[in-house]
Amino acid sequence: ELCDDDPPEIPHATFKAMAYKEGTMLNCECKRGFRRIKSGSLYMLCTGNSSHSSWDNQCQCTSSATRNTTKQVTPQPEEQKERKTTEMQSPMQPVDQASLPGHCREPPPWENEATERIYHFVVGQMVYYQCVQGYRALHRGPAESVCKMTHGKTRWTQPQLICTGEMETSQFPGEEKPQASPEGRPESETSCLVTTTDFQIQTEMAATMETSIFTTEYQ
């Protein structure tokens, strides 16, 4: 069963799935100026059996100007920069998550993919949160969210995480300010939702975010 909506948004935090449950769909979206090859499916699908899971179908993008060819164009330096975070492969993926039965790893990048990935999660999926560079975590509980089915409807549990600016007066649990809806926040703040291919250690993530801030997309 697909989750009806997205994981909750926490101001100044990113979320990430360490592994994707079977049934998860990933849209094959291409960056501007490129399109999916005509024969290609619109999705990658995490499928498998009890012993092995993998992504069905491969996403491929071709230049919009080239009608009947799948010739790939090498990204320009600025294009490489904008996708830098997506393309990082971390050696730090926890073994227990990556090798979970019935789960797929993060799919490798494909040439000229869009700067955000659009995932469609399934019930039982867990995502993990951490604060972006310049903010520190005040935990009241687990910094994770799970898609659950209750009374025939899907919902994400609320992660117990507050990200506070290091230079601000500390905001302690119990003093939490009301959160504005995601659409109510300024665009610059919304775009702080950054997701890497795998969680990096904080310093590595901070360094990355100085050069590239964008959202890896989930839906």
Epitope: D4, D6, E9, E29, R36, A114, T115, T190, E217, Q219
Partner: antibody
Framework: QVQLVQSGAEVKKPGSSVKVSCKAS????????INWVRQAPGQGLEWMGR????????NYAQKFQGRVTITADKSTSTAYMELSSLRSEDTAVYYC????????WGQGTLVTVSS | DIQMTQSPSSLSASLGGKVTIACKAS??????IAWYQHKPGKGPRLLIH???TLQPGIPSRFSGSGSGRDYSFSISNLEPEDIATYYC?????????FGGGTKLEIK
């Protein structure tokens, strides 16, 4: 609960343009995929195109390429579909729908093209 | 573009009975098919996606099956509120295409 609310009915002259809006509530609009579909009187459903607001990516059906423009305003959680060079055969009910399998639909907007 | 051939275009059945609608794609659509119920003056309603996944809140009287190019949709134990036009949609390929629709009437 996700809701898509569309703008009201329009009467247009041939050769003019129409812009239909679709305001979303519930969920995170920028992460939506918004599709536009139309149904002419006595006809079936016809996909026109889609937009992914956070990507700024639009895709259009070949039939409408060059005549339809789909946009989105993240600040107001609203998607728009503009159809230009209207002709009488564009008289139809226009719908917006979420996701690629159209899980939630707007109530529809009747556009009448008549001289 | 992928063509979706839906049959029959109309059908009539008795209350409590069962009906089946077929959709044939012009190429393999990898199970990415959805089924909708459309009543006059309303927006269509998603019943089933990914061939057989029932949308939350949709009764189990509705079901879907198929693979490759051939797919079917059934309603059992027909009720008066099932009177509507039903459409299939392929969403495997970005140029999404609907079937021509099946108008269901109750005898």
């Amino acid at each position: 609960q996700v809701q898509l609310v569309q703008s009201g009915a329009e009467v247009k002259k041939p050769g003019s343009s129409v812009k239909v809006s679709c305001k979303a509530s519930g969920g995170t609009f920028s992460r939506y995929i918004i599709n536009w579909v139309r149904q002419a009187p006595g006809q079936g459903l016809e996909w026109m195109g889609r937009i992914i607001p956070i990507l700024g990516v639009e895709n259009y059906a070949q039939k409408f390429q060059g005549r339809v423009t789909i946009t989105a305003d993240k600040s107001t959680s609203t998607a728009y579909m503009e159809l230009s060079s209207l002709r009488s055969e564009d008289t139809a009910v226009y719908y917006c729908a979420r996701k690629d399998w159209f899980d939630y639909w707007g109530q529809g907007t009747l556009v009448t093209v008549s001289s | 573009d992928i063509q979706m051939t839906q049959s029959p275009s109309s059908l009539s059945a008795s209350l409590g009975g069962k009906v089946t609608i077929a959709c044939k794609a012009s190429q393999d659509i990898n199970n990415y098919i959805a089924w909708y119920q459309h009543k006059p003056g309303k927006g269509p309603r998603l019943l089933i996606h990914y061939t057989s996944t029932l949308q939350p809140g949709i009764p189990s009287r509705f079901s879907g099956s198929g693979s490759g190019r051939d797919y079917s949709f059934s309603i059992s134990n027909l009720e008066p509120e099932d009177i509507a036009t039903y459409y299939c949609l392929q969403y495997d390929n970005l140029l999404f295409t609907f079937g021509g629709g099946t108008k269901l009437e109750i005898k």
